[in-house]
């Protein structure tokens, strides 16, 4: 995929350019991660590569999201799996595939999910395979709540930045 | 599908009639784009019908949004695909489907991906079929940027205003 | 799925602390729903529970969202369908799901679809299976719009907060 | 290295209830099928079922259906097998599998028996 | 359910014979949408799980020597050893997957002459 690990990106210059012309003069929490491609077997998220940026607050710590200040935001998620390699052996059952945008808050203790899609994959029926999914909502979320994403098929992902990427932005 | 062709739409009603009381004060740059029904074999976008509207410096050239002013975005699209004409001889071979929004920006001399969805439909084991593509997210945009998009298997696509379009809004 | 059915959810909380620092002062009409897993047969949306609300004019009457006041608006929704029980006697006829957000408006007689995801199962073929559909976009409202939903394939939808849900927000 | 471990076997009185555990690891395990098969002493391969960790699916063999109950906990990557009303012909070698990647665990003999 | 039944239930072979073993399905494992027959052949030997060898009836599993190899479509299908080892004395199955339940053959014991 072209624009794949350019340096600097679109992301860094803004950031580095803090005098450019800016559409609006009130910055706003918002944040855009994309999977890490280096890690074939997890799901890491990065804010500092391609176009992938935080700002205004938001912070990434321990694979999640962490909201800077309270208030409504938009969160979104897209995923995308694919199978050739891997093929099924000795049954046609299908391959589970989900991706789910959790919510951890101090007034529960544990994850809330916000955001779940979820499809069967039959892998031996047809392959190669390929499946996109995306979901989105507005939440109200405190400050210090922590947004974290959580993935049955990770061995699957296409990881890439227009391909896997979790975001959210304040309203 | 009800509602299609309308003339004027809403969105036209709103540019024609300046005064009708905003929710908000300030415009923010906003566009919001269908596929034109009457082309089959391309994905040409119209902002000048239907729901369809660009507001506060967004233009629509060569078939690219373009960027008024710098800043974070979010931008988004879909497409609905389907088939039906296939032969029983096409089952072994699947059908890739894929639906990219790209940037082109003066910063790099080629197109980067934005978003990407992808799919492998096998339309002589699934006849008829249809699939639906939906992604969207936020970026650090720069005035000037151009935004487009590029689909495999736009003769499938199944085009109205509430099934292929392609938006962008400042945040 | 963990947090279902909370109360008083964050969102609730939120509305009984008004104090509680908000990331932005102009408070702007936004709107999350999601469907009542109580009504198996039937797509009932609800804004008093878990993390649903409508904020700043947004109302829910006849099972419509009625837009406070004239402007663009994002608009979203998703659902979520599964199936396990049919048999194999169905393999060769699919199941048509779709779902669609619709505007009825003051202007037109009728209700305009907004947002289309269509989608055909062949449950016999591939069973179990699971299927996601989301869709979301700007569009220009008017003050006493009415966003509703209308799905085919209701009795195969998986009801929970996460999966099945149904909002907008005021750009 | 990818393994599956099942444990939880042993000597069980005619109609009572056992419950068997099968540890993954080495590979994701949420998305791929647990297959359940046994094998009297002597005799062939049984299937009795399969569980999908991630989405809670489950598909019986007829044969078991209201006897056996399969479930799993995805954080700690383990299914289960719950067999109830045991009968002298229960006992077995059960044995769980991936199919989608060919795994078998090495099994744990189970014997209904006063 | 679909039925698997393999002949002989048991051989007596030699070190170096080339040993085939038949399995029949009461209907076809043949998907015709990717010609694949969802086929699996085990080894199992005594004490021990069994082992996958092939898979849709002729793909062999990584590591499986190749002295082993599986043919077949539809509803007819053969496991050979080309050159039977030491090692090879075994249990063997067929197993469908096609469908619901999955079924096993009864088992071919292949024993030294």
């Known amino acids: 995929l072209p624009g794949v690990g350019l340096t600097p990106s679109a992301a860094q210059t803004a950031r580095q350019h803090p005098k450019m012309h800016l559409a609006h003069s009130t910055l706003k929490p918002a944040a855009h991660l994309i999977g890490d491609p280096s890690k074939q077997n997890s799901l890491l998220w990065r804010a500092n590569t391609d176009r992938a940026f935080l700002q205004d607050g938001f912070s990434l710590s321990n694979n999640s999201l962490l909201v800077p200040t309270s208030g409504i935001y938009f969160v979104y998620s897209q995923v995308v799996f694919s199978g050739k390699a891997y093929s099924p052996k000795a049954t046609s059952s299908p391959l589970y595939l989900a991706h789910e945008v959790q919510l951890f808050s101090s007034q529960y203790p544990f994850h809330v999910p916000l955001l779940s899609s979820q499809k069967m994959v039959y892998p031996g029926l047809q392959e190669p395979w390929l499946h996109s999914m995306y979901h989105g909502a507005a939440f109200q979320l405190t400050q210090g709540d922590q947004l974290s994403t959580h993935t049955d098929g990770i061995p699957h992902l296409v990881l890439s930045p227009s391909t896997v990427f979790f975001g959210a932005f304040a309203l | 599908l009800p509602g299609v062709g309308l003339t004027p739409s809403a969105a036209q009603t709103a540019r024609q009639h300046p005064k009708m009381h905003l929710a908000h004060s300030t415009l923010k740059p906003a566009a919001h784009l269908i596929g034109d029904p009457s082309k089959q074999n391309s994905l040409l976008w119209r902002a000048n019908t239907d729901r369809a509207f660009l507001q506060d410096g967004f233009s629509l050239s060569n078939n690219s949004l373009l960027v008024p002013t710098s800043g974070i975005y979010f931008v988004y699209s879909q497409v609905v695909f389907s088939g039906k004409a296939y032969s029983p001889k096409a089952t072994s071979s699947p059908l890739y489907l894929a639906h990219e929004v790209q940037l082109f920006s003066s910063q790099y001399p080629f197109h980067v991906p934005l978003l990407s969805s992808q799919k492998m439909v096998y339309p002589g084991l699934q006849e008829p079929w249809l699939h639906s593509m939906y992604h969207g997210a936020a970026f650090q945009l720069t005035q000037g940027d151009q935004l487009s998009t590029h689909t495999d298997g736009i003769p499938h696509l199944v085009l109205s205003p509430s099934t292929v379009f392609f938006g962008a809004f400042a945040l | 799925l963990p947090g279902v059915g909370l109360t008083p959810s964050a969102a609730q909380t939120a509305r009984q602390h008004p104090k509680m620092h908000l990331a932005h002062s102009t408070l702007k009409p936004a709107a999350h729903l999601i469907g009542d897993p109580s009504k198996q047969n039937s797509l009932l949306w609800r804004a008093n529970t878990d993390r649903a609300f409508l904020q700043d004019g947004f109302s829910l009457s006849n099972n419509s969202l009625l837009v406070p006041t004239s402007g663009i608006y994002f608009v979203y929704s998703q659902v979520v369908f599964s199936g396990k029980a049919y048999s194999p006697k169905a393999t060769s006829s699919p199941l048509y799901l779709a779902h669609e957000v619709q505007l009825f408006s003051s202007q037109y007689p009728f209700h305009v679809p907004l947002l289309s995801s269509q989608k055909m199962v062949y449950p016999g073929l591939q069973e179990p299976w699971l299927h996601s559909m989301y869709h979301g976009a700007a569009f220009q409202l008017t003050q006493g719009d009415q966003l509703s939903t209308h799905t085919d394939g209701i009795p195969h939808l998986v009801l929970s907060p996460s999966t099945v849900f149904f909002g907008a927000f005021a750009l | 290295e990818v393994q599956l471990v099942e444990s939880g076997g042993g000597l069980v009185q005619p109609g009572g209830s056992l419950r068997l555990s099968c540890a993954a690891s080495?590979?994701?395990?949420?998305?791929?099928?647990i297959e359940w098969v046994r094998q009297a002493p002597g005799k062939g391969l049984e299937w009795v079922g399969e569980?999908?960790?991630?989405?809670?699916?489950?598909n019986y063999n007829e044969e078991f259906k209201g006897r056996a109950t399969f479930s799993a906990d995805n954080s700690k990557n383990t299914a289960y097998l719950q067999m109830n009303s045991l009968r002298a012909e229960d006992t077995a070698v059960y044995y769980c599998?991936?199919?989608?990647?060919?795994?078998w665990g090495q099994g744990t003999l189970v014997t209904v028996s006063s | 359910d679909i039925q698997m039944t393999q002949s002989p239930s048991s051989l007596s072979a030699s070190v170096g014979d080339r040993v085939t073993i038949t399995c029949k399905s009461s209907?076809?494992?043949?998907?015709?949408?990717?010609?694949?027959?969802?086929l699996a052949w085990y080894q199992q030997k005594p004490g021990k799980a069994p082992k996958l060898l092939i898979y849709?009836?002729?793909t062999r599993d990584s590591g499986v020597p190749s002295r082993f190899s599986g043919s077949g479509s539809g509803t007819d299908f053969t496991l050979t050893i080309s050159s039977l080892q030491p090692e090879d004395f075994a249990t063997y199955y067929c197993?469908?997957?096609?469908?619901?339940?999955?079924?096993f053959g009864q088992g071919t014991k292949v024993e030294i002459k």
């Open positions: 197993q469908q997957a096609y469908s619901y339940p999955r079924t």
């Open positions: 569980i999908s960790p991630g989405s809670g699916s489950t």
């Open positions: 080495g590979y994701t395990f949420s998305s791929y099928w």
């Open positions: 849709w009836a002729s």
């Open positions: 209907q076809s494992l043949l998907y015709s949408t990717n010609q694949k027959n969802f």
């Open positions: 599998a991936d199919g989608y990647h060919g795994y």
